[in-house]
């Protein structure tokens, strides 16, 4: 199942995807498409790279802002709208026979929440990120609130909370 990423309307969405160039600097073509990964390449391509640089972008809202030359091909969609919601395919086109790495991720764009008085930390984390960490490998995903987060300490929660606030996005798996 796809990992879900949540962004508010008007914010930037960040969809992670990466690979390790081997040897370093030996880049491979990558495509991002709207819709699940098809049999080959990407459908409804929004951005494409070649062995050197981004060579195709369907809109100025799509960017690779990470260190592309180190294999960070995470997609940033600027100023998202509800229409940007859906599954995206990141395909790392490693040369060879049926060698590609395929990653489907789901973007959920939500309307901005109304401003309310800040609740307690426990309630804030639970309501803001109710499905932040879930188990998607074995059957239906199971919600885990911060009270039952496995192997996560408060420092990690604070760090993650701040990062998510900065990016305007949250993460969950479906």
């Amino acid at each position: 199942s796809e990992v879900e990423y949540i962004a508010e309307v008007g914010q930037n969405a960040y969809l992670p995807c990466s690979y390790t160039p081997a040897p370093p600097g030996n880049l491979v073509p990558v495509c991002w498409g709207k819709g699940a990964c098809p049999v080959f390449d990407c459908s409804n391509v929004v951005l494409r790279t070649d062995n050197r640089d981004v060579n195709d972008r369907t809109s100025g809202r799509y960017w690779l802002k990470g260190d592309f030359h180190k294999g960070d091909v995470s997609l940033t969609i600027e100023n998202v709208t509800l229409a940007d919601s859906g599954v995206y395919c990141c395909r790392i086109q490693i040369p060879g026979i049926m060698n590609d790495e395929k990653h489907n991720v789901k973007l959920v764009v939500i309307k901005p929440a109304k401003v309310t008085p800040a609740p307690t930390l426990q309630r804030d984390l639970t309501s803001a990120f109710p499905r932040m960490l879930t188990t998607g490998e074995h059957g239906p995903a199971e919600t885990q609130t911060p009270g039952s987060l496995p192997d996560v300490n408060l420092t990690q929660i604070f760090t993650l909370t701040n990062e998510l606030r900065d990016s305007g996005a949250t993460i969950r798996t479906a």
Partner: antibody, heavy 119, light 108 residues
Framework: EVQLLESGGGLVQPGGSLRLSCAAS????????MSWVRQAPGKGLEWVSA????????YYADSVKGRFTISRDNSKNTLYLQMNSLRAEDTAVYYC????????????WGQGTLVTVSS | EIVLTQSPGTLSLSPGERATLSCRAS???????LAWYQQKPGQAPRLLIY???SRATGIPDRFSGSGSGTDFTLTISRLEPEDFAVYYC?????????FGQGTKVEIK
């Protein structure tokens, strides 16, 4: 106008080899994925193989994997299919086809070349 | 692999009538990655529909596609003499690419 012209078909004995060519014109060849699709006499369509615009990525049907090799020469605007260890069940019309700019389906097809595998 | 089953095998209709062709997949076709082709005797196939419902360039609007998941339909609203042919569906959501066995639309 997009044109695809296949050649290289013919009669070959089981276990033999054949190389099909497809000369393309009317579009920027190196920008598009290309595919081979075959059709046995009186039967339906069967996808055989596909190759990316650069030639770096290739895909094959299980029925031909390890026996057929797809390649392309972008300087000559030509697509190839090298067929080895041919079997009677490979007898078919082989079509060269251009993938749509949004790949995985085929918007232009050649007229096909007949490959007959028989002793 | 995804098996596509087309029905009926043969459709006997008269010019001017409506044709409804079905394509059923053995498992869900992701993102409606389904195309339809037309093939006349002795000719190469011709792309009609992709993405389940988008008409290819130059295809008359009497051809329309619909459906999602496992059930897809090609509709020809009013058959013209040149529409009598074999029609194939093809999925491209799951490896390998696969085609249905075809539906023949013949003159009644």
């Amino acid at each position: 106008e997009v044109q695809l012209l296949e050649s290289g078909g013919g009669l070959v004995q089981p276990g033999g080899s054949l190389r099909l060519s497809c000369a393309a014109s009317g579009f920027t060849f190196s920008n598009y994925w290309m595919s081979w699709v075959r059709q046995a006499p009186g039967k339906g369509l069967e996808w055989v193989s596909a190759i990316s615009g650069s030639g770096g990525s290739t895909y094959y049907a299980d029925s031909v994997k390890g026996r057929f090799t797809i390649s392309r020469d972008n300087s000559k605007n030509t697509l190839y299919l090298q067929m080895n260890s041919l079997r009677a069940e490979d007898t078919a019309v082989y079509y060269c086809a251009k993938d749509h700019w949004d790949p995985n389906f085929l918007d232009y097809w050649g007229q096909g070349t007949l490959v007959t595998v028989s002793s | 692999e995804i098996v596509l089953t087309q029905s009926p095998g043969t459709l006997s209709l008269s010019p001017g009538e409506r044709a409804t062709l079905s394509c059923r997949a053995s498992q869900s076709v992701s993102s409606s990655y389904l195309a339809w082709y037309q093939q006349k005797p002795g000719q190469a196939p011709r792309l009609l529909i992709y993405g389940a419902s988008s008409r290819a360039t130059g295809i008359p609007d009497r051809f329309s596609g619909s459906g999602s998941g496992t059930d897809f339909t090609l509709t020809i609203s009013r058959l013209e003499p040149e529409d009598f042919a074999v029609y194939y569906c093809q999925q491209y959501g799951s490896s390998p690419l696969t085609f249905g066995q075809g539906t023949k639309v013949e003159i009644k």
